[in-house]
Interface confidence: low
């Protein structure tokens, strides 16, 4: 029977600059229950704060709700790992959350062959920025990735489309059928899942020819 | 610019009250936990006090624990410490922080 | 008596570098990040370096911060006359400030 191991705090997120979670890596449990603390303060502050919410992200987790969380502030944290014969602590973590958010994907991707008769066709490829996030603020840019391949192909092909929420992609395999899908990142974070593929049928009759 | 105007202190008698006062501007004041430090004629610092945003949360140290009280009125943008039952040890200068800085001038309490 | 232990007194000469210590234990100094203040002659403190080694807008390179494991340490180079001072070393467990007892630093 010894002291816990130390724990690692090895990743923190936030999907909108509004709330975000913390997640720790229990160290070796020394063969006895162990109790886990996750304790906080903010850069230039003073009060020493314990986790508000262990719940809602699941085992060895801290939630800070919306009240908690603070743009432009670091968080510096640590957890606590006690159990009857001592305690251990992670290194501090240093967490601003204007580097960690990773939004939800983005939403309603719609796509559209179109084939004007006075250009070349493409295809149209629509979308939505995630619901959590508030662009009208100003200081939240999103860009956006779009990745498509035909059904039965290994290899995505992709686009950057920038801040754009549309995009137009003119060279297309005729007759296959593509898969596409859309991602977002901040331009100071991470980058969020794909969405769900949405299936497009390329007609036969589609051309590429300049 | 930020700034912490202590006011308030005075030569009071053993077992007397007095309330001092800390008015802050530059900064938006309930963004931010308060404290009060204080320091004996030619010694060192002594934590007194704090105070969170909100008022929900306050600390102090058990030198002072029962007979000082902080507040703050966030609508004045003023930071209080209300002391009772004063004692000759309690003979400071009394500051007040915004965080860990900066700090006022302070206010000289002579018991 | 203050928990966190640092010398009464340093000297040094203009151009030389001086270290002020602070120790205390693993309860204290090791499970806490440490602040330093500055408190020049008839003047408030000032914060020098928080969160160990971190130095706000407008202190000088030539203070640095360190900790390791139950001490920390203040680091002035190039020392200058301005820098005759009172030095005080602080942590917040729980909730509570606790600075360590006063370093009176002389430039000779």
């Known amino acids: 029977q010894l002291p816990p191991g130390k724990p690692e705090i090895f990743k923190c997120r936030s999907p909108n600059k509004e709330t975000f979670t913390c997640w720790w890596r229990p160290g070796t449990d020394g063969g006895l229950p162990t109790n886990y603390s996750l304790t906080y303060h903010r850069e230039g502050e003073t009060l020493m704060h314990e986790c508000p919410d262990y719940i809602t992200g699941g085992p060895n987790s801290c939630h800070f709700g919306k009240q908690y969380t603070s743009m432009w502030r670091t968080y510096i944290m640590m957890v606590n790992a006690t159990n009857q014969m001592g305690s251990s602590f992670s290194d501090e973590l240093y967490v601003d959350v204007t580097y960690i958010v990773q939004p939800d994907p983005p939403l309603e991707l719609a796509v559209e062959v179109k084939q004007p008769e006075d250009r070349k066709p493409y295809l149209w490829i629509k979308w939505s920025p995630p619901t959590l996030i508030d662009l009208k603020t100003g200081w939240f840019t999103l860009l956006y990735e779009i990745r498509l391949k035909p059904e039965k192909a290994a290899e995505w092909e992709i686009h950057f489309a920038g801040q754009q929420t549309e995009f137009k992609i003119l060279s297309l395999h005729p007759g296959q059928k593509y898969l596409v899908q859309v991602r977002c990142k901040p331009d100071h974070g991470y980058w969020s899942a794909w969405s769900p593929a949405t299936f497009i049928q390329i007609p036969s009759d589609f051309t590429m020819n300049d | 610019e930020v700034q912490l105007l202590e006011s308030g202190g005075g030569l009071v008698q053993p077992g007397g009250s007095l309330r001092l006062s800390c008015a802050a501007s530059?900064?938006?004041?309930?963004?931010?936990?308060m404290s009060w430090v204080r320091q004996a004629p030619g010694k060192g610092l002594e934590w007194v006090s704090l105070i969170s945003w909100d008022g929900g949360s306050t600390y102090y140290a058990d030198s002072v624990k029962g007979r000082f009280t902080i507040s703050r009125d966030n609508s004045k943008n003023t930071l209080y410490l209300q002391m009772n039952s004063l004692r000759a040890e309690d003979t400071a200068v009394y500051y007040c922080t915004r965080g860990f800085d900066p700090w006022g001038q302070g206010t000289l309490v002579t018991v | 008596q203050s928990v966190l232990t640092q010398p009464p007194s340093a000297s040094g000469t203009p151009g030389q570098r001086v270290t002020i210590s602070c120790s205390g234990s693993?309860?204290?100094?090791?499970?806490?990040?440490v602040n330093w203040y500055q408190q020049l002659p008839g003047t408030a403190p000032k914060l020098l370096i928080y969160d160990n080694n971190k130095r706000p807008s407008g202190v000088p390179d030539r203070f640095s911060g360190s900790k390791s494991g139950t001490s920390a340490s203040l680091a002035i180079s190039g020392l200058r006359s301005e820098d005759e001072a009172d030095y005080y070393c602080m942590i917040w467990p729980s909730n509570a400030w606790v600075f360590g007892g006063r370093t009176k630093l002389t430039v000779l």
């Open positions: 693993s309860s204290n100094i090791g499970s806490n990040t």
């Open positions: 530059g900064f938006t004041f309930d963004d931010y936990g």
